[in-house]
């Protein structure tokens, strides 16, 4: 059965938008007006994952691209990357764990915790134009809260 997906954009809690930075990286920066069209549109897929009260397992693909955010170890550190997949096989209900994020939503603020690396979150820097990354701290300098805006399919 096909997995259910919704198209959306994400902004961090400082209202920075996410845009492509080269073929396999996202960066966060403030956009206005027509520049808003640069922001990436995600296809958020609702996938199978471990049961938990307040966590919803999702995969985050880039709309109409065969790229998914994934979490892997690089030099022994959990790292966020954009991974290319075979579009014939993705998205699917049972995504590999590296592609799965636990969406935690409180008062319309979203966090995305790596299912592969608990307590590591999709993060942005306070500074402008820096890469989106996987961070191991919450409530510190780095930003782990996002808002979501629906995009028409």
């Amino acid at each position: 059965a096909p997995v259910r997906s919704l198209n959306c954009t994400l902004r961090d809690s400082q209202q920075k938008s996410l845009v492509m930075s080269g073929p396999y990286e996202l960066k966060a920066l403030h956009l206005q007006g027509q520049d808003m069209e640069q922001q990436v549109v995600f296809s958020m897929s609702f996938v199978q994952g471990e049961e938990s009260n307040d966590k919803i397992p999702v995969a985050l693909g880039l709309k109409e691209k065969n790229l998914y955010l994934s979490c892997v170890l690089k030099d022994d550190k959990p790292t966020l990357q954009l991974e290319s997949v075979d579009p014939k096989n993705y998205p699917k209900k049972k995504m590999e764990k590296r592609f799965v994020f636990n969406k935690i939503e409180i008062n319309n603020k979203l966090e995305f915790e790596s299912a592969q690396f608990p307590n590591w979150y999709i993060s942005t820097s306070q500074a402008e134009n820096m890469p989106v990354f996987l961070g191991g701290t919450k409530g510190g300098q780095d930003i782990t809260d996002f808002t979501m805006q629906f995009v028409s399919s």
Epitope: A1, L6, E105, N108, F150, S152
Partner: antibody
């Protein structure tokens, strides 16, 4: 508090159409699917389709495709279900319900229902 | 479409009885299952969502369990206000489908 208030009962002729409304209040309309479910007299529940007002995504039960149209007006937080080419077996109570966009809490609030009677 | 069977279609029980209702599906429906209660002339009321999570305000005598294809609603000690019809729904795959209902009547 969350409320889904539906339009009143309708009596329709076979072959005609009916449009049922569902006005939402007490929550962010954009972020919840509005579901449409019907129940024929003395029968069980049957899912007809859904709309997510924030994105405009719509999914229909194939059984009703071509006869049912689901829309939403974000300015008034109202969803609509129109059923055309009515026949006697469409006589039922039509319900709207809501479900969060991520499907987490199922159909958690329901409208009071709208009785549609199809009779010549 | 996902095939499903809700059983029993009706049962007679007394106040204080433990009641169990089951829904079985033709394929895995993950966590997308809700149980409803419906009384005559009223809209359905949600009791349990995501298989086993109790809706706020629903008494703890109601519980849900199961995974994959087999799910159960249990009323641990039936109360007078519990006499009603109970439905499950799967919303894992289109079209979403309701069980045929279980009417719980007074013995």
């Amino acid at each position: 508090q969350v409320q889904l208030v539906q339009s009143g009962a309708e009596v329709k002729k076979p072959g005609s159409s009916v449009k049922v409304s569902c006005k939402a209040s007490g929550y962010t309309f954009d972020r919840y699917w509005i579901e449409w479910v019907r129940q024929a007299p003395g029968q069980g529940l049957e899912w007809m389709g859904e709309i997510l007002p924030g994105s405009g995504d719509i999914n229909y039960n194939e059984k009703f495709k071509g006869r049912v149209t689901i829309t939403a007006d974000k300015s008034t937080s109202t969803a609509y279900m129109e059923l055309s080419s009515l026949r006697s077996e469409d006589t039922a109570v039509y319900y709207c319900a809501r479900m969060y966009y991520d499907y987490d809490q199922g159909f958690d609030y329901w409208g009071q229902g709208t009785l549609v009677t199809v009779s010549s | 479409d996902i095939q499903m069977t809700q059983s029993p279609s009706s049962l007679s029980a007394s106040v204080g009885d433990r009641v169990t209702i089951t829904c079985k599906f033709s394929q895995d429906i993950d966590r997308f299952l809700t149980w409803f209660q419906q009384k005559p002339g009223k809209a359905p009321k949600s009791l349990i969502y995501r298989v086993k999570r109790l809706v706020d305000g629903v008494p703890s005598r109601f519980s849900g369990s199961g995974s994959g294809t087999d799910f159960t609603l249990t009323i641990s000690s039936l109360q007078p206000e519990d006499f009603a019809t109970y439905y499950c729904i799967q919303y894992d795959e289109f079209p979403y489908t309701f069980g045929g209902g279980t009417k719980v009547e007074i013995k």
